[in-house]
């Protein structure tokens, strides 16, 4: 056969679907690889062909579209399973071709099992809700195109294993789940089960997502430097190790680039001829506020180093702050013998 533009195995389309549920999978060619859509391709006389390679096999084989009750079918650029079976797992290829043109891409499909509490190896999308922010909603994802708008499905929402009914601040509203005031206690996995009829059969779609309650933009503040501060003086003798921690609190801000850095005499530590190391650690609160600590370390400090200005800077999308550390040279205690001699007027 003639040369075919092979886009390889697109692992970005690592599709996971639940066993014994309908699945509709669009050919990724039109979404990510080609500059035209299926309708244009079809009008130009191109044919879309599907085939697959079973899990742990090397042999490509055609998809059987003659199964009872049309369990697997194709409609335009969509491959349908009504429903899936565990052994449908494998790599699927869609190929667009005519006598002069050919383009194809493969993608992995994994059919996964779930238990009665919806636990499974499925990778879950995360939806962030702002804490105490007023009414916020999540929507049952990826159910478009499974049934016509004339069909009215029933939707049941669960938190973990429990059906959501008579919850204090969580109200099911069809495809949406409303949180009146999101609290930390609302963190968890939420599942919608959509049930709809089709040709005398009943199908279920199960969709689970993780809700994470994060800090509200209403409460967001510029970075706060806890250390260095005015209460701590770093008093050292030459030859000792100087350790200055810079500890900064950042409010959670969606997509904010939080940064902490030290300057010495207004310059990057690298631009100064002293042997400085800086170690960073980052921790997060339950609402994803962030605390960054950067410890500036000079192994053997000199009297010159103790005269320098050490400033910690912090910046987020909310603003910028800076704080100088109080560094000074320790005054050596007077030697007792000298003091005594002076007291007696010795010369």
């Amino acid at each position: 056969s003639e040369r075919c533009d092979d886009w390889g195995l697109d692992t970005m389309r690592q599709i996971q679907v639940f066993e014994d549920e309908p699945a509709r999978i669009k050919c990724p060619l039109f979404e990510h690889f080609l500059k035209f859509n299926y309708s244009t391709a079809h009008s130009a006389g191109l044919t879309l062909i599907w085939y697959w390679t079973r899990q742990d096999r090397d042999l490509e084989e055609p998809i059987n579209f003659r199964l009872p009750e049309n369990r697997i079918s194709k409609e335009k650029d969509v491959l349908w399973f009504r429903p899936t079976l565990l052994n449908d797992t494998g790599n699927y290829t869609c190929m667009l071709r005519n006598t002069t043109y050919c383009s194809k891409v493969a993608f992995p499909l994994e059919v996964v099992q779930k238990d009665s509490c919806f636990n499974s190896p499925m990778k879950l999308p995360v939806h962030k809700l702002y804490i105490e922010y007023g009414i916020q909603r999540i929507t049952c994802p990826n159910v478009d195109g499974y049934f016509p708008s004339s069909v009215k499905p029933t939707i049941t929402w669960y938190m973990g294993c429990y059906k959501i009914q008579n919850f204090n601040n969580v109200i099911p509203e069809g495809m949406n789940l409303s949180f009146l005031i999101a609290l930390i206690s609302n963190n968890g996995n939420y599942t919608c089960v959509v049930t709809y009829p089709e040709n005398g059969r009943t199908f279920h779609l199960t969709r689970t997502l993780t809700v994470k309650v994060v800090g509200s933009p209403k409460n967001a503040v510029p970075p706060v430097i806890h250390s260095p501060n005015d209460h701590v003086v770093y008093e050292k003798e030459p030859g000792e190790e100087l350790l200055i921690p810079c500890t900064v609190y950042f409010s959670f801000l969606m997509d904010s680039r939080n940064e902490v850095w030290w300057t010495i005499d207004g310059k990057k530590p690298d631009d100064i001829t002293i042997d400085v190391t800086i170690n960073e650690s980052i921790s997060h609160s339950r609402t994803e506020d962030e605390t960054r600590t950067q410890i500036l370390s000079i192994k053997k400090v000199t009297s010159e180093d103790l005269k320098r200005s050490y400033v910690c800077h912090a910046r987020s999308a909310k603003g910028e702050v800076a704080k100088a550390a109080k560094v000074k040279q320790k005054v050596p205690a007077p030697r007792y013998t000298v003091e005594l001699a002076c007291g007696f007027g010795a010369t």
Epitope: R257, W261, W262, P269, T277, I278, E280, S281, R315, A317
Partner: antibody
Framework: EVQLVESGGGLVQPGGSLRLSCAAS????????MSWVRQAPGKGLVWVAE????????YYPDTVTGRFTISRDNAKNTLYLQMNSLRAEDTAVYYC???????????WGQGTTVTVSS | EIVLTQSPATLSLSPGERATLSCSAS?????MYWYQQKPGQAPRLLIY???NLASGIPARFSGSGSGTDFTLTISSLEPEDFAVYYC?????????FGQGTKLEIK
């Protein structure tokens, strides 16, 4: 003298993988956040990935999330970019660049060319 | 995502003239950064924190602006200044660049 030298570029088929390296010298590598920035032929600059000083935090744009992985070895003063499921639109010159605090991308490598084509 | 739009796309001027390049952000950013790129070379940092000159950059370059509107000015063009200029925001992920302004000799 600060130097960043990229390597590992080349021709790869769609769906294939490539690992880029960036060897750093002339500065305290572990004190700097590092990034990869790419430039498709005749196009502008596009940020691809960033890694924190210690390597524990990584950041990506949606276009490469799940396909590209940035990592670093501070003992070897080397930055890496593992690129999987490559597509034609990933064809570009890939630069590594360092950043410190409010000094973003003050030094860049000379770039390494990645071509994705069947 | 914060989108940066640079104008004009191309600016044709003569050496000695003043160049004004604009960068507009789709939402407010704290600071803007500017880079210069010549053909076949890596970009070079010109301006950081909106108005600070990077190390080794001549004083004819200056930056200004706040919020969503930022400007790079070259007071008197030298022959070596003809290149592509990019603005970049550093406030939010994903980090984004403008599409570039090509400064060419008239």
């Amino acid at each position: 003298e600060v130097q960043l030298v990229e390597s590992g570029g080349g021709l790869v088929q769609p769906g294939g993988s490539l690992r880029l390296s960036c060897a750093a010298s002339g500065f305290t590598f572990s004190s700097y956040a590092m990034s990869w920035v790419r430039q498709a032929p005749g196009k502008g600059l596009v940020w691809v990935a960033e890694i924190s000083r210690g390597g524990s935090h990584t950041y990506y744009p949606d276009t490469v999330t799940g396909r590209f992985t940035i990592s670093r070895d501070n003992a070897k003063n080397t930055l890496y970019l593992q690129m999987n499921s490559l597509r034609a639109e990933d064809t570009a010159v890939y630069y590594c660049a360092r950043s410190y605090g409010n000094y973003p991308f003050d030094y860049w490598g000379q770039g390494t060319t990645v071509t994705v084509s069947s | 995502e914060i989108v940066l739009t640079q104008s004009p796309a191309t600016l044709s001027l003569s050496p000695g003239e003043r160049a004004t390049l604009s960068c507009s952000a789709s939402s407010s950013v704290s600071y803007m950064y500017w880079y210069q790129q010549k053909p076949g070379q890596a970009p070079r940092l010109l301006i950081y924190d909106t108005s600070n000159l990077a190390s080794g950059i001549p004083a004819r370059f200056s930056g200004s602006g706040s919020g969503t509107d930022f400007t790079l000015t070259i007071s008197s063009l030298e022959p070596e200044d003809f290149a592509v200029y990019y603005c970049q925001q550093w406030s939010s992920y994903p980090l984004t660049f403008g599409q570039g302004t090509k400064l060419e000799i008239k």
